[in-house]
């Protein structure tokens, strides 16, 4: 008989390299049987995970699995870091593995001179 426990399918050590200034959706795959659990996102700050308030979230259903999505519109440099989703199910708290976002600041990258430019300035 199939287990009806809630399961969160974020892979261990999952990572995303993303660009600041563009949108991104961070997905938490949630498997449940009858009632959809209450799911939240938090961001790791040292050993504590700070719940993300005032953030846009949504659900997406695909086949027999649901995705609880954290929307970044757009990604900001400050969004760099590790996130975790957690589900409340029958008074139990189930936590996912953390997933890490590596944010590239495209403005500072495009404004920063290349090594060649720096060298030519130095020797000019």
């Amino acid at each position: 008989k199939e287990s009806c426990d809630v399961q969160l399918y974020i892979k261990r050590r999952s990572e995303h390299s993303i660009l600041a200034g563009d949108p991104f959706e961070l997905e938490c795959p949630v498997k449940y049987c009858a009632n959809r659990p209450h799911v939240t996102w938090c961001k790791l700050n040292g050993t504590t995970c700070v719940k993300l308030e005032d953030r846009q979230t949504s659900w997406k259903e695909e086949k027999n699995i649901s995705f609880f999505i954290l929307h970044f519109e757009p990604v900001l440099p400050n969004d760099n870091g590790s996130y975790r989703c957690s589900a409340n199910f029958q008074s139990n708290l189930i936590e996912s593995h953390s997933t890490t976002l590596y944010v590239t600041d495209v403005k500072s990258a495009s404004e920063r001179p290349s090594k060649d430019e720096m060298a030519s300035r130095f020797w000019a």
């Epitope: 200034g21 949108p23 519109e73 757009p74």
Partner: antibody, heavy 120, light 106 residues
Framework: QVQLKESGPGLVAPSQSLSITCTVS????????VHWVRQSPGKGLEWLGV???????SYNPAPMSRLSISKDNSKSQVFLKMNSLQTDDTAMYYC??????????????WGQGTSVTVSS | QIVLSQSPAILSASPGEKVTMTCRAS?????MHWYQQKPGSSPKPWIY???NLASGVPARFSGSGSGTSYSLTISRMEAEDAATYYC?????????FGGGTKLEIK
């Protein structure tokens, strides 16, 4: 310096479509997003949608089914197309640059706007 | 959608007077932006992310607030401050504006 300039038809007949072009200078469409905002006497300022640097779009869910935003990076142009116009779509349409700081996002540079009147 | 309610709709102030206008959100937002608009012109960024003054904005302006309640304050009203001020949230799509506070000089 940063500039955005809208060009539109001015007058559109009811049920027809609207096409507005926003030509930008002083920044790259591959680094900054461009938004469309309209201002009408009845509805005030209304955010319509955005063309993100990477080419994705986000829309206001209310007029979303009638809206389409596209761009041509090489020409530094962003396009707004809106179908099935009604008289309450009469407004000033602005294109606006979006920019991010470390921990917030905002619209900083606004075009001068193009006035659109929907009337037969 | 998050509805932003600005009050008062119209505000009249004398030169030198302290002015405060408020913006209330129907749900909590991370921060609030403010734009100034004068007749015949496009809106101009005025205050970013609740309290950061945009470039060229006089220091007599300040912004504060959190959650669902935000305000813009002018320490001493000047004639050039007469304009309409709009609050704007970038926390949840659709990204909405308040209805505006029209500030007039007495």
């Amino acid at each position: 310096q940063v500039q955005l300039k809208e060009s539109g038809p001015g007058l559109v007949a009811p049920s027809q479509s609207l096409s507005i072009t926003c030509t930008v200078s002083g920044f790259s469409l591959t680094t900054y997003g461009v938004h469309w905002v309209r201002q009408s006497p009845g509805k005030g300022l209304e955010w319509l949608g955005v063309m993100w640097p990477g080419g994705r779009t986000s829309y206001n869910p209310a007029p979303m089914s009638r809206l389409s935003i596209s761009k041509d990076n090489s020409k530094s142009q962003v396009f707004l197309k809106m179908n099935s116009l009604q008289t309450d779509d009469t407004a000033m349409y602005y294109c606006v640059r979006g920019d991010y700081e470390y921990d917030y996002y905002a619209m900083d540079y606004w075009g001068q706007g193009t006035s659109v009147t929907v009337s037969s | 959608q998050i509805v932003l309610s600005q009050s008062p709709a119209i505000l009249s102030a004398s030169p030198g007077e302290k002015v405060t206008m408020t913006c209330r959100a129907s749900s909590s937002v991370s921060y609030m932006h403010w734009y100034q608009q004068k007749p015949g012109s496009s809106p101009k960024p005025w205050i970013y992310a609740t309290s950061n003054l945009a470039s060229g904005v006089p220091a007599r302006f300040s912004g504060s607030g959190s959650g669902t309640s935000y305000s813009l304050t002018i320490s001493r009203m000047e004639a050039e401050d007469a304009a309409t001020y709009y609050c704007h949230q970038w926390s949840s799509n659709p990204y909405t504006f308040g209805g505006g506070t029209k500030l007039e000089i007495k």
